[in-house]
């Protein structure tokens, strides 16, 4: 299921990096959010639950991310204009069941004043 | 007419298998998580399997391992394969279809809002 | 596996009268839970989703309230028709899908 552009800020820009906002519904208890540049896999991170409710978090492309209980930040640094480009956060929710997969993004514009270390 | 027609339902002895079957019309069939519900003629309502859209399959404890669901959205179908059937497993199947939408933040479910008529599965010797 | 208490079992009721309906899930399932109307011999009819949103073509008199473990149907003003057996479900936490026992709505 593509659900197109975002309809929240996914963009938030720090320091001459970039935090993109991958949120999910806090019902959702397992899954695996990945963070796709064009159709390119930058990134993801899995959260599944084990017995006792034990929570695993692995990642497979591991970028600094952050994780609450409705989204899924991951943080790219030095940015610089080859990061200009379509941004998907790619969800697969695995419980509650039945298994969905849902895409959102939007395009991430780098100007001048964003850019690390910019020659004064 | 949105309509769920069930068929494949008959008398079988223990221990027999039965293939029942789902047609769909007027539609979205591929965007529906599809099940199984049975009912015990005079009881409730017993969910017995599900399908979601991507082919992931579900199974209540007293049918796993016996019975198979499958889908084939080109024939806008549902198929129920049962295996080793029981006393137990006579009743009215119905299939019913029901979808989950994910938005941002937002998780939709809108009910089993497509029902067939049910098709009759005896198990008797 | 969430269970799923509907109450009374039976309710009897003159058309015109105000029906409520009650059912009680063993856990929390915060809205995600449906109502459905079976008459003899026809398959279930959903009349309510998430908890109080009104399926399509279901009459106004049908109303759905509730949030996390406690749920009421209610029939504003009972037409001839309402008479019927009354399920609640519940698919958030599965497999498997629960459906309460049934309430009967029966004419006095």
């Known amino acids: 299921e593509i659900n197109g552009s975002a309809n929240y800020e996914m963009f938030i820009f720090h320091n001459g990096g970039v935090q993109i906002l991958c949120k999910y519904p806090d019902i959702v208890q397992q899954f695996k959010m990945q963070l796709l540049k064009g159709g390119q896999i930058l990134c993801d991170l899995t959260k599944t639950k084990g017995s006792g409710n034990t929570v695993s978090i692995k990642s497979l492309k591991f970028c600094h991310s952050q994780l609450s209980n409705n989204s899924v930040s991951f943080f790219l640094y030095n940015l610089d204009h080859s990061h200009a480009n379509y941004y998907f956060c790619n969800l697969s929710i695995f419980d509650p069941p039945p298994f969905k997969v849902t895409l959102t993004g939007g395009y991430l514009h780098i100007y001048e004043s964003q850019l690390c270390c910019q020659l004064k | 007419e949105v309509q769920l027609v069930e068929s494949g339902g008959g008398l079988v002895q223990p221990g027999g298998s039965l293939r029942l079957s789902c047609a769909a019309s007027e539609f979205i069939f591929s965007t529906y998580d599809m099940h199984w519900v049975r009912q015990v003629t005079g009881k409730g309502l017993e969910w017995v399997s599900a399908?979601?859209?991507?082919?992931?399959?579900y199974y209540s404890d007293s049918v796993k391992g016996r019975f198979t669901i499958s889908r084939e959205n080109a024939k806008n179908s549902l198929y129920l394969q049962m295996n080793s059937l029981r006393d137990g497993d006579t009743a009215v199947y119905f299939c019913?279809?029901?979808?989950?939408?994910?938005?941002?933040?937002?998780?939709?479910?809108?009910?089993?809002?497509?029902w067939g008529q049910g098709t009759t599965v005896t198990v008797s010797s | 596996e969430v269970v799923l208490t509907q109450s009374p079992a039976t309710l009897s009721l003159s058309p015109g009268e105000r029906a409520t309906l009650s059912c009680r899930a063993s856990q929390n399932i915060r809205n995600y839970l449906a109502w459905f109307q079976q008459k003899p011999g026809q398959a279930p009819r959903l009349l309510i989703y998430g908890a109080s949103n009104r399926a399509t073509g279901i009459p106004a008199r049908f109303s759905g309230s509730g949030s996390g473990t406690d749920f009421t149907l209610t029939i504003s003003s009972l037409e001839p028709e309402d008479f019927a057996v009354y399920y609640c479900q519940q698919r958030i936490n599965w497999p498997p899908i629960t459906f309460g026992q049934g309430t009967r709505l029966e004419i006095k």
């Open positions: 399908i979601g859209t991507a082919g992931d399959t």
């Open positions: 019913t279809g029901d979808r989950t939408v994910v938005r941002g933040v937002n998780y939709y479910y809108y009910g089993m809002d497509v």
